[in-house]
């Protein structure tokens, strides 16, 4: 950065090099150039010469004043016009930053994605600070009182192997930057209550031709959790509103969910699951499209998840990883 240049003088900022966005600031430049009584002192911001709000304080020093400074970052340097020099002489430079103190972190959430081996903690950091802001995640065992701290600039993954103090913990987050520090409320967690099952995936769909065509959605998860509740949501692609349906699930076999849908309509489906009775859900699975036929039965699989439709064809394919037996997973 500009701070690495060799200086022939001194540049400083009041109130500070990092300051609150919108403040009035003063930048001072003091020349210390051998055999030079500066005729004039110039200020540059991001390489562009400033023409206004410059005050000469004494023979060697000048001040540049900014009202309501709103730029997150700027490189400042100043130069002197020396009587016997053809070019301006560089005095010194400084990078300045403006921003905000951190908000109180809220919505602290810690989950363990099944098979990940990590506890992932996230939070709402609040408004953008524009300046370097660090977060310290505190994890305190309620059984041993031992506390661990993790430094990060966003979220944190904590190895579950490092959580040796039993099952119950307090988690809180401290946010700090040059302008201030804030601390979240404490979140109490039990490791068994924050596990999110392995992602549920829709593998294929087919519409069976009958008096009333029936669409079957095939979906699965590699979870080993016994009691899992899932939601499937679907809508016609032309609609805004989702239909959300709940399924009691047993992932010892591929799930088959049956729907009576309108003919000749393109639908989109998504699924998500949680350990039954627990707090946290998986994110919704990726969008799965299926167009119901007018009359001809149709199969749609992961291999055909583009915006093209093989109308009139019976497409029968299966995604790898979904080769278990297709028993019906839902009743009623």
């Amino acid at each position: 950065g500009i701070t690495n240049i060799n200086c022939s003088g001194h540049i400083w900022v009041e109130p500070a090099t990092i300051f609150k966005m919108g403040m009035n600031i003063s930048i001072y430049c003091q020349a210390a150039i051998k055999n030079c009584q500066p005729r004039k002192l110039h200020f540059y911001k991001n390489g562009i010469k400033e023409r206004f709000q410059i005050t000469r304080i004494n023979k060697t020093t000048a001040r540049l004043w900014y009202k309501n400074f709103l730029e997150p970052h700027a490189s400042m340097y100043c130069t002197a016009e020396c009587p016997k020099h053809f070019q301006e002489t560089l005095i010194c430079g400084k990078d300045i930053s403006s921003g905000y103190p951190p908000d109180i972190p809220d919505e602290v959430t810690c989950v363990i994605y099944e098979y990940s081996g990590n506890m992932t903690c996230t939070w709402n950091a609040g408004k953008l600070t524009y300046i370097d802001t660090k977060y310290v995640v505190h994890v305190k065992s309620l059984e041993t009182e031992e506390e661990q701290q993790y430094l990060t600039s966003s979220y944190i993954n904590i190895s579950t192997d490092s959580l040796q103090g039993g099952k119950k913990y307090l988690v809180w987050v401290q946010a700090a930057n040059a302008l201030g520090m804030e601390e979240s409320k404490q979140l109490q967690i039990h490791l068994d209550d924050i596990v999110i099952p392995s992602a549920a995936v829709i593998s294929r769909a087919e519409t069976i031709n009958a008096t009333v065509p029936k669409t079957i959605i095939y979906w699965d998860s590699q979870t080993t959790i016994e009691k899992v509740s899932c939601e499937m949501r679907y809508k016609a692609t032309t609609n805004q509103t989702w239909n959300v349906k709940e399924f009691d699930t047993n992932f010892t076999y591929v799930q088959q969910s049956e729907f009576y849908l309108e003919p000749n309509i393109k639908y989109v489906f998504q699924v998500r699951c949680q350990e039954t009775g627990k707090r946290y859900w998986q994110p919704w699975s990726s969008l799965f499209f299926h167009k119901t036929p007018e009359t001809v039965p149709q199969v749609t699989s992961k291999a055909f998840q583009h915006d093209t439709w093989n109308s009139g064809l019976t497409v029968a394919s299966i995604s790898t990883g979904h080769l278990t037996s297709d028993n019906r997973g839902d009743i009623g």
């Epitope: 959300v244 349906k245 709940e246 399924f247 729907f259 009576y260």
Partner: nanobody, 124 residues
Framework: EVQLVESGGGLMQAGDSLRLSCAAS????????MAWFRQAPGKEREFVAA????????YYADSVKGRFTASRDNAKNTMYLQMNSLKPMDTAVYYC?????????????????WGQGTQVTVSS
């Protein structure tokens, strides 16, 4: 759309029997499951019984098992709830509901269409 109209409710004595009917009209070919729910004053709506339309498989809440029987008349697009050995705790508004898919039968939120309800009051 499926329209549902319940009938047969009334004021009964404990131990009596009563038959509720639910007549469906409109897109009845889209019925996957038809169910009865009930709601007592100040309480949440709860599952009572359901019948899967395609194969007449029936499901019951534990509180009514052995006393209530769900059946259907396919030709009339009508579902019935035969209620025997009525108890004061059976007092509620009984609602008929339909869903178009194989989602969990006892969840209120899974049902797409609802009737207006019929009042059943059982005095001791």
């Amino acid at each position: 759309e499926v329209q549902l109209v319940e009938s047969g409710g009334g004021l009964m004595q404990a131990g009596d029997s009563l038959r509720l009917s639910c007549a469906a009209s409109g897109r009845t070919s889209y019925i996957y499951t038809m169910a009865w729910f009930r709601q007592a004053p100040g309480k949440e709506r709860e599952f009572v019984a359901a019948i899967r339309w395609s194969d007449t498989t029936t499901y019951y809440a534990d509180s009514v098992k052995g006393r209530f029987t769900a059946s259907r008349d396919n030709a009339k697009n009508t579902m019935y709830l035969q209620m025997n050995s009525l108890k004061p705790m059976d007092t509620a508004v009984y609602y008929c509901a339909v869903k178009r898919d194989s989602s969990t039968y006892y969840r209120v939120r899974n049902y797409d269409y609802w009737g207006q309800g019929t009042q059943v009051t059982v005095s001791s």
